[in-house]
């Protein structure tokens, strides 16, 4: 048993038919030594008296807030949590899988560019009872420091039958160059807690393995005369590092009617600008990746050809 | 240290075209690690990263952007001296931070070549033969340090007289290569930068 | 399976013309782009020009240009090369390659030599 | 136009040897670069596109790398049936240019 927070505790269970549980001692924080009585949750049944209470956890019924009382009066509680481990591996019940870039990708992090900011995201079908905590820390062993607010609910969507909600924090560390060379990883711990479960999620990362730029901006088309080629030009976008001349990006220009599987143009350049041939009905887009190590690709920046 | 925007002549950057091709070099060699050593630890998330430089050469911070010594996180207080007389600086009015941020380049590049001959070595002695380093990288090593073309004290090769431990050797390799692939992407933004500048 | 079908051998005289054919099957005609690239004997490949069959838009070498028509008909689904003012240099074999991609070639057909000898 | 240069416009190589082919673009184009193979009498066949993607069907031993303008196509462990010419052509620009070829010969 462990603290999570003031009068937050977690018990870890090997989770098995049968499994002999945790024998956990509570102390009621309180002076007094008599007349102390113990309830668990609504229920008014008297588990047991005396300043300390020993209970079995084996299973969610035994979890919950544990209250000790004097005379109707209430001196302290605390709240039980159950953390399962099943054939020695923790349960990960809250969180789905993303499956992307592998599978047990729990947390996803993105960042604009290589000022030390991120935002994780994760899903879940749970609507209710559900709080999230987020730390984070530049290495482990001398962690330094990285800030990161709320989680908050940022998309909800419907899947099949069931709802899916995106919850996503946002962190900064808190010195960060952007041109330094990092060798310790971004270390994201997110715990999770479900009415009287509770699991913890991480992720380990360099910033430079999860940018993603945003797209180019100000897309912009000229007809070039006697041809059917245009001259596309565009912008850095207003959120990646600075010097572009130090952080440069590449781009992948592409002209491509509505479905994907429609003929297309596609040119890939350093420049910030390109010759495409346009086509009626179709759109020109571009979108940008860092030039010297290849991260993620940008979402497209989209204009229609005519 | 910082670079000032400085304005080389517009034939300063033979550099650029030599940083461009360490990159490809280093990175192609980085992938061919990891497909031929598939059951080591070979990954990015697998290695320790270790930077053979660290305390010898300053390179992110002798060759940081006039734009970001504003930013105190970027301003370390580590001291080298460097010597100045490279072919890439194409005037003598060529300031002394870009000198010490291109002799700082040269150093690194000294340092990871002794290095990764003396690995190569002890690969050709292995009896499963299973990876070499890729001569062209080697040579395009040594390209850019002609290219910066700066006088310094020759190191020695590492010669060690113990039977090499193969399996260690081979992951050694792999954490040289994450981190020379790191610093190779420093250098062409550094080049990069300077070019445009 | 994409396969494109080129028509036959054709002997020239300098200064006539010359149309070769190139059928498609085994895709939908208009959602590939058309190319010719010709290649003379014991030389390299150079390409002339591509034809959008969906809406008849072509793009030619500039060297070629006033010499060279590339037509597509969707009915036939055939793509069609005419050469004119042919002259002894213009002897080579004429391929046709189609892509969804305009700027490289995924399918080939198996080549028409033209041969040009007074 | 832009030109491409292809080195060495002839190898010489065995059966298991390691053959790098290195095309040069008369000015950048970034990774808007394709491999062909061609065998005597028969069209060209498509091997890598933009630079280093590699086809369906294309034995993995054929890998390509390069941008800007230096580029190679790398044949790891040669086979009999990769005797043949290939050439490289960039797609940066129209007129779509190919390099003169490299001949890959038996020693």
């Known amino acids: 048993i462990w603290e999570l927070k003031k009068d937050v505790y977690v018990v870890e269970l090997d989770w098995y038919p049968d499994a002999p549980g945790e024998m956990v001692v509570l102390t009621c924080d309180t002076p007094e030594e008599d007349g102390i009585t113990w309830t668990l949750d609504q229920s008014s049944e008297v588990l047991g008296s005396g300043k300390t209470l020993t209970i079995q956890v084996k299973e969610f019924g035994d979890a919950g807030q544990y209250t000790c009382h004097k005379g109707g009066e209430v001196l302290s509680h605390s709240l039980l949590l159950l953390h399962k481990k099943e054939d020695g591996i923790w349960s990960t019940d809250i969180l789905k899988d993303q499956k992307e870039p592998k599978n047990k990708t729990f947390l996803r992090c993105e960042a604009k560019n290589y000022s030390g900011r991120f935002t994780c995201w994760w899903l879940t079908t749970i609507s209710t009872d559900l709080t999230f905590s987020v730390k984070s820390s530049r290495g482990s062993s001398d962690p330094q420091g990285v800030t990161c607010g709320a989680a908050t609910l940022s998309a909800e969507r419907v899947r099949g039958d069931n709802k899916e909600y995106e919850y996503s924090v946002e962190c900064q560390e808190d010195s960060a160059c952007p041109a330094a060379e990092e060798s310790l990883p971004i270390e994201v711990m997110v715990d999770a807690v479900h009415k009287l479960k509770y699991e913890n999620y991480t992720s380990s990362f360099f910033i430079r393995d999860i940018i993603k730029p945003d797209p180019p901006k100000n897309l912009q088309l000229k007809p070039l005369k006697n041809s059917r080629q245009v001259e596309v030009s565009w912008e850095y976008p207003d959120t990646w590092s600075t010097p572009h001349s130090y952080f440069s990006l590449t781009f992948c220009v592409q002209v491509q009617g509505k479905s994907k599987r429609e003929k297309k143009d596609r040119v890939f350049t350093d420049k910030t600008s390109a010759t495409v041939i346009c086509r009626k009905n179709a759109s020109i887009s571009v979108r940008a990746q860092d030039r010297y190590y290849s991260s993620s690709w940008s979402e497209w920046a989209s204009v229609p050809c005519s | 240290r910082n670079l000032p925007v400085a304005t080389p002549d517009p034939g300063m950057f033979p550099c650029l075209h030599h940083s461009q091709n360490l990159l490809r070099a280093v990175s192609n060699m980085l992938q061919k690690a990891r497909q031929t050593l598939e059951f080591y630890p070979c990954t990015s998330e697998e290695i320790d990263h270790e930077d053979i430089t660290k305390d010898k050469t300053s390179t992110v911070e002798a060759c940081l952007p006039l734009e970001l010594t504003k930013n105190e996180s970027c301003l370390n207080s580590r001291e080298t001296s460097f010597i100045t007389n490279g072919s890439c600086l194409a005037s003598r009015k060529t300031s002394f931070m870009m000198a010490l941020c291109l002799s700082s380049i040269y150093e690194d590049l000294k340092m990871y070549q002794v290095e990764f001959k003396t690995m190569n070595a002890k690969l050709l002695m292995d009896p499963k033969r299973q990876i070499f380093l890729d001569q062209n990288m080697l040579a395009v090593i040594d390209e850019l340090m002609q290219a910066l073309n700066f006088n310094s004290e020759t190191v020695p090769q590492k010669s060690s007289l113990e039977e090499p431990d193969f399996y260690k050797t081979k992951i050694k390799l792999c954490i040289l290569l994450h981190a020379f692939r790191i610093r190779a992407v420093t250098i062409d933004r550094v080049m990069s930068y300077l070019n445009a500048s | 399976e994409v396969q494109l079908v080129q028509s036959g051998a054709e002997v020239k005289k300098p200064g006539a013309t010359v149309k070769i054919s190139c059928k498609a099957s085994?895709?939908?005609?208009?959602?590939?782009?058309l190319h010719w690239v010709r290649q003379a004997p014991e030389k390299g490949l150079e390409w002339m020009g591509w034809i959008d069959p969906e809406n008849g838009d072509t793009e030619y070498a500039p060297k070629f240009q006033g010499r060279v028509t590339i037509t597509a008909d969707t009915s036939t689904d055939t793509g069609y090369l005419e050469l004119s003012s042919l002259r002894s240099e213009d002897t080579a074999v004429y391929y046709c390659?189609?892509?969804?991609?305009?700027?490289?070639?995924?399918?080939w057909g198996q080549g028409t030599l033209v041969t040009v000898s007074s | 136009d832009i030109q491409m240069t292809q080195s060495p416009s002839s190898v010489s190589a065995s059966v298991g040897d390691r053959v790098t082919i290195t095309c040069r673009a008369s000015q950048s184009i970034s990774i808007n670069l394709h491999w062909y193979q061609q065998k005597p009498g028969k069209a060209p066949k498509l091997l890598i596109y933009?630079?280093?993607q590699s086809i369906s069907g294309v034995p993995s031993r054929f890998s390509g790398s390069g941008s800007g303008t230096d580029f190679s196509l790398t044949i790891n462990s040669l086979q009999p049936e990769d005797f043949a010419r290939y050439y490289c052509q960039q797609s940066n620009s129209f007129p779509l240019t190919f390099g003169g070829g490299t001949k890959v010969e038996i020693k």
């Open positions: 085994g895709y939908t005609f208009s959602d590939y782009y």
């Open positions: 390659a189609a892509n969804k991609e305009l700027r490289y070639f995924d399918v």
């Open positions: 933009f630079a280093s």
